[in-house]
Interface confidence: medium
């Protein structure tokens, strides 16, 4: 049997050591103990008694099925306890009585059906994070379960087999910053929603089939709900249930952000928000995020004209990796307040982009992200976007562009352009001179000789440059990131010729540790203030005797340098 490894600060690692019991020899010097992925099965009353100063105890996936009632009695300083993914079929309030300092408790993934016959947590007045429940057996949430808890930063409940929710069970917790609920069906959603309206600021619903969700007025008085964010992850919706969900918004008037991740819409986008007051109640929603939305019949999808008015006040929209090939012109024109639009990882091509960015489209748009679509012509893309009079930032990275021409047109206010991972080999005057930030990372550039008088930040890492670009090209440059190129040296003269340079990230290049370079680095301790990741990322590539040495540590041979 292997033993623990502990560092000087009392952090002890005993993960995956095949322990069959809590190891002996634990001491009061231990601050953190991780015994995850073992075969401990049983924790006796004296097993942890020596650990009076323990602050972190992690017992994840250790096959524990029995814990004596007073096993944790000496752990008054414990702040973090993880008992997740064990075999605890029942929970005891006596375990937690002594743990008055506890801030984090994870009981998830154990096969209990309820949280126990009495309240588990009345003494945990400092608790900030609580994770409970499991996939198969946790079936009932009761009013006694959360007694004594008044405020939590995070509460996560995995209740995919929930058979009953006693009304007002969650109401006793007056303030929950982030509540994550794993519910397989929408059956208890209305009750739970009613109980958390006045306490939860961010509600995240996971793995829920909402296809049969039906709204009914909630049995609540007028509440001023603090909820600012609502997220659905791995949920299944239909056109009808989406309409029903919208009706919940009348109870959360301060909602500012809605998110759908990895959801499936079994519908055609035939939304019909029947309640006219829904429109005004969406008034404070500023951010809508949709990632990896799966629409089995996406080829039959509607034009969304029924929700145009819902989105007129939204400022930030992300629809990522969801097979978007067109935002209809009329929809774009309705997005009057939109300042940020991210359509990364979709199917946009120039022909349809032209329709999306029609005259009057996205009149307030400042940032457009079209990363990893199917754009091919930089020239055509710039021309299409001339309609966007307020556009300052454009990300067209991860598109495979044809070689750029000498001349292109771009929106006149554009200051930021991301062309990273676009396969470009040469930069030409197609790139606008108005830019303040340019990202051409991860391309095939072996030189950069474009004059950009306003450029303040240049990102050119992961290319093939052998030297730093000429400083005269960028008179006001503040930041240059040129990692992972083939730069062999830099000198005092080179760096000195960038009059305003504050940050240079040039690590992981192929430095030739010549007498000049090593002398310069030895004589210039101030390099540490300019060079990011100095000294660890700055290694000699040659000569062979210094290969792998840090520039800072490498010493030139007296013979070589004083001939």
């Amino acid at each position: 049997q292997e033993s623990l490894s502990c560092d000087a600060s009392g952090v002890c690692d005993g993960r995956s050591r095949s322990f069959t019991s809590i190891p002996s020899g634990l001491t009061a010097a231990m601050k953190s103990l991780d015994l995850s992925f073992n075969k401990i099965t049983y924790i006796g009353h004296g097993d942890l008694r020596a650990c009076a100063n323990l602050q972190v105890l992690i017992l994840k996936s250790s096959r524990i099925n029995t814990i004596e009632g007073d096993a944790f009695y000496s752990l008054g300083s414990l702040e973090h306890l993880d008992l997740s993914d064990n075999h605890l079929s029942s929970l005891s309030s006596s375990w937690f009585g002594p743990l008055s300092s506890l801030k984090y408790l994870n009981l998830m993934g154990n096969p209990y059906q309820t949280l126990g016959v009495t309240s588990l947590f009345p003494n945990l007045t400092n608790l900030q994070t609580l994770r409970i429940g499991n996939v198969e057996t946790f079936s009932e949430i009761r009013r006694i379960d959360f007694a004594g808890l008044t405020s939590l930063n995070e509460l996560e409940i995995k209740a995919l087999s929930l058979r009953n929710y006693q009304s007002q069970s969650l109401k006793s917790i007056r303030d929950i910053h982030h509540l994550t609920l794993h519910l397989s069906e929408s059956a208890f959603l209305l009750e739970i929603f009613a109980d958390i309206l006045s306490s939860v600021r961010y509600l995240e619903l996971r793995d829920t089939n909402l296809a049969r969700f039906q709204f009914s007025p909630l049995p609540v008085d007028e509440v001023s709900s603090p909820m600012k964010k609502l997220a659905f992850r791995g949920s299944v919706l239909t056109d009808e249930s989406f309409n029903e969900l919208l009706k919940l918004l009348r109870y959360i008037l301060e909602l500012s952000e809605v998110e759908f991740d990895d959801c499936t819409l079994n519908g055609l986008g035939d939304f019909n928000p029947s309640e006219s007051d829904v429109v005004s109640e969406l008034g404070k929603v500023e951010t809508v995020t949709i990632r990896r939305l799966h629409i089995p019949q996406f080829y039959l999808f509607y034009d969304l004209s029924t929700v145009y008015s819902l989105l007129e006040k939204v400022k930030r929209i992300t629809v990522e990796n969801s097979k978007v090939f067109l935002v209809p012109c009329s929809f774009s024109q309705h997005l009057k307040s939109l300042e940020f639009l991210d359509l990364s990882e979709n199917l946009m091509v120039e022909e349809y982009l032209k329709n999306s960015a029609c005259k009057g489209a996205w009149p307030s748009l400042q940032t457009l992200v079209l990363s990893q679509n199917h754009l091919r012509s930089m020239q055509k893309t710039g021309e299409i976007l001339l309609t966007l009079k307020n556009l300052t930032s454009l990300d067209i990275s991860r598109n495979t562009f044809h070689p750029m021409p000498d001349s292109c047109q771009w929106p006149e206010k554009m200051r930021f352009l991301n062309l990273s991972s676009t396969g470009i080999r040469v930069v030409k005057t197609c790139i606008p001179q108005t830019l303040e930030v340019l990202d051409v990372s991860n391309n095939n550039l072996d030189s950069f000789s474009l004059f950009l008088p306003r450029l303040q930040e240049l990102y050119i890492s992961r290319n093939k440059l052998k030297t730093l670009p000429d400083a005269s090209l960028f008179p006001v440059l503040l930041v240059m990131k040129i990692r992972e190129n083939a730069v062999s040296t830099f000198s005092k003269d080179q760096l000195g010729s960038f009059p305003k340079l504050e940050t240079l990230e040039a690590g992981d290049n192929h430095f030739v540790c010549s007498c000049e370079l090593l002398s310069f680095t030895m004589e210039t301790p101030a390099l540490a203030q300019i060079l990011v990741d100095w000294p660890d990322s700055y290694l000699c590539d040659s000569p062979p005797r210094l290969h792998g040495h840090r520039l800072q540590d490498a010493r030139p041979s007296v013979l070589e340098c004083h001939q």
Partner: nanobody, 124 residues
Framework: EVQLVESGGGLVQAEGSLRLSCVAS????MGWFRQASGKEREFVAA??????????DSADSAKGRFTISRDNAKNTVYLQMTSLKPEDTGVYYC???????????????????WGQGTQVTVSS
């Protein structure tokens, strides 16, 4: 509108038993409440659609003596009362939550539909 019809009340000796029935027009979360003369309506038991039950938390309640059950095929909910005491005397009401609610509740305000009540009198 959900119609609720209670039956089974009556006069019974202390330590005796009674079974109350409530027929509903539909399958809902159902509850039994009671009201003694001059007192507030008090939660007795509740049952959800799948048969999970809920009783009052307090130790001196009827839990252990009273059992709620349902027969969905007959749209009927039962309250089996044993070891009855004089303090169990009162009007027993059957209540139903709206169709879209699935969780049990001990709060009268969460129930939208109510029966007319059936009198239970326990003599000593």
């Amino acid at each position: 509108e959900v119609q609720l019809v209670e039956s089974g009340g009556g006069l019974v000796q202390a330590e005796g038993s009674l079974r109350l029935s409530c027929v509903a027009s539909g399958t809902h979360v159902m509850g039994w409440f009671r009201q003694a003369s001059g007192k507030e309506r008090e939660f007795v038991a509740a049952i959800n659609r799948s048969g999970s039950t809920d009783y009052p938390d307090s130790a001196d309640s009827a839990k252990g003596r009273f059992t709620i059950s349902r027969d969905n095929a007959k749209n009927t909910v039962y309250l089996q009362m044993t070891s009855l005491k004089p303090e169990d005397t009162g009007v027993y009401y059957c209540a139903a939550r709206k169709a879209f609610y699935f969780g049990t509740s001990s709060y009268p305000s969460d129930y939208a539909y109510w029966g007319q009540g059936t009198q239970v009198t326990v003599s000593s």
